[in-house]
């Protein structure tokens, strides 16, 4: 969930050095605060569509609204894998795609969105109320997951509006890198604000909104912001409230919600481990574990249509030295 600050409208102060300085010290913190609360958190959207031609055929589309590079996308159904869900497809920007039945065709649509077509026959075919989840592992944000399903009354051929991200998991990796800089910025901002309290404020024209801590409001991506991100199908229905962790009632709703706390702590040796280890410079990490891919230049990159490659969180590992111990 992203939040944005409503910045109070400031009238220009009276001319003069003190006025100019006061203007600068007031505007800078508010700009910083706006950046602080809007730039930090990515979103995931999910769209589920039942095909009109084949009643038990589904198309799932997922996208990531974030600035980081995507390392992996996992699509599951029946909830997140590890919390009662079953993996349907895993997509890696360089290494390719792995699918499980009844997945028929998974592919990259853009660098930040994927689609998956599900076969609709046999015991493993999906039903109309199935929950589909997409998890994006991204650097530096960490892992972000959202789920969606067809509304009970859906007509074939109609799609459920993409759901704004119920963010089920944000690894500690999100605190690193850019987020770390933001955190520092926010601390610095608070310091500025505290200092500003003890200074005579410049005279302002009366305003309805007093320059106190701004109210934050829930943010759903606007059409304009999505267009800027070039993410297709991301027409967010802002009328629907994003599901959050407070929907995790043990006795109500889909059964997998009750397992969310377990799922949130599901990968203890994942990015959280970075917090206690030195973080190498981006692209400098070389592991000799993947001895299989030692012959440089032999491994063709797996790319989807129009997909350009972007770096893995831990640097280039596709072609490395002979097998050895890290």
């Amino acid at each position: 969930m992203r939040t944005e600050a409503q910045v109070p409208a400031l009238q220009p102060p009276e001319p003069g050095l003190e006025g100019a300085m006061g203007h600068r010290t007031l505007v800078l913190p508010w700009v910083l605060l706006t950046l602080c609360v809007t730039a930090g958190t990515p979103e995931v959207w999910v769209q589920v569509r039942m095909e009109a031609t084949e009643l038990s055929s589904f198309t799932i589309r997922c996208g990531f609204l974030g600035s980081g590079s995507i390392s992996l996308v996992t699509v599951s159904w029946g909830g997140p894998n590890g919390a009662g869900g079953t993996t349907l497809a895993v997509l890696h920007p360089e290494r390719g795609i792995r699918q499980w039945a009844p997945a028929r065709q998974a592919r990259w649509e853009t660098q930040s969105s994927i689609s998956l077509i599900l076969e609709g026959s046999g015991a493993s075919s999906p039903c109309a109320n199935t929950t589909f989840c997409c998890k994006f592992a991204s650097f530096p944000e960490g892992s972000w997951e959202a789920c969606g399903s067809l509304p009970p009354s859906s007509d074939p051929g109609l799609s459920a509006p993409p759901t704004p991200a119920p963010i089920l998991r944000a690894d500690l990796a999100g605190i690193l890198g850019v987020s770390g800089v933001l955190l520092f910025g926010c601390v610095y901002l608070l310091h500025l604000l505290r200092r500003h309290k003890h200074r005579p404020a410049p005279r302002l024209q009366p305003s309805r909104t007093s320059p106190q801590a701004p109210r934050a409001r829930a943010w759903a991506p606007s059409q304009a912001s999505q267009a800027a991100l070039h993410v297709p199908y991301a027409t967010i229905n802002t009328s629907c409230r994003p599901a959050t962790l407070d929907t995790a009632h043990p006795h109500g709703g889909p059964s997998w919600w009750a397992s969310l706390p377990t799922h949130a702590a599901h990968r203890p040796q994942g990015p959280a481990a970075w917090a206690s280890t030195p973080i190498p410079a981006r692209g400098s990490f070389v592991s000799v574990e993947n001895g299989l891919y030692a012959q440089a230049g032999e491994r063709p990159p797996h790319t989807g249509p129009g997909l350009t490659l972007f770096p893995d969180p831990r640097g280039p590992r596709a072609m490395e030295g002979p097998l050895g111990v890290r």
Partner: antibody, heavy 126, light 107 residues
């Protein structure tokens, strides 16, 4: 030395249970998906089960689902396969195999197997 | 589940000859196919991954080709140690499945 060593095989009656172990050494065990692959006498290879690196997500072949349980102990660098309700058709050499791709974060696995143990024979017979 | 059919079941050749092994998938597996070599009493050994890429330490005489449903493993000039059983494996649609194997024997 990079290696996998299976143990725990033997003769068991139909309906019985057996627990196989696979000790890994010489590599970062927690960063690899690990699988069990079996081979019936004189037959081809059949993938049985897999478990992801640190997340512990599990996968099973339909033929063993509900009867076999895969697990791992990353602190001991050991992979396990608990086999219950054994049938004659489960008779095979069971190999422990390492996924070719090392990934301790995102969870990707290639599902190609670049390191295999020597295998342990499981015989189900009355 | 994707079925892999290997042919021929047995290939009788002499050292120095060229061996061509085939693997056909029941549906497209893109290029997500591997080849393994297995000698009697030993575990399988990964030779080729992603249809055409040699694994570490595999001699250049081994090469793989193909995509979609038809794949070929070629051994350009057979060495005495190459006589073994060869399996193909697909990983496009999981669970991974193996072909029935091709035995390359000395003529």
């Amino acid at each position: 030395e990079v290696q996998l060593l299976e143990s725990g095989g033997g003769l068991v009656q139909p309906g019985g249970s057996l627990r196989l172990s696979c000790a890994a050494s010489g590599f970062t065990f927690s960063g690899h998906l690990m699988s069990w692959v079996r081979q019936a006498p004189g037959k081809g290879l059949e993938w049985v089960s897999a478990i992801s690196g640190s997340a512990g997500e599990t996968y099973y072949a339909d033929s063993v689902k509900g009867r076999f349980t895969i697990s791992r102990d990353n602190s001991k660098n050991t992979l396990y396969l608990q086999m219950n309700s054994l049938r004659a058709e489960d008779t095979a050499v069971y190999y422990c195999a390492r996924d070719a791709y090392y990934d301790d974060w995102s969870g990707w696995a290639d599902w190609y197997f670049d390191l295999w143990g020597r295998g342990t024979l499981v015989t189900v017979s009355s | 589940e994707i079925v892999l059919t290997q042919s021929p079941a047995t290939l009788s050749l002499s050292p120095g000859e060229r061996a061509t092994l085939s693997c056909r998938a029941s549906q497209s597996v893109s290029r997500y196919l591997a080849w393994y070599q297995q000698k009697p009493g030993q575990a399988p050994r990964l030779l080729i991954y992603d249809a055409s890429n040699r694994a570490t330490g595999i001699p250049a005489r081994f090469s793989g080709s193909g995509s979609g449903t038809d794949f070929t493993l070629t051994i350009s000039s057979l060495e005495p140690e190459d006589f073994a059983v060869y399996y193909c494996q697909q990983v496009s649609l999981l669970p991974p499945t193996f072909g029935g194997g091709t035995k390359v024997e000395i003529k």
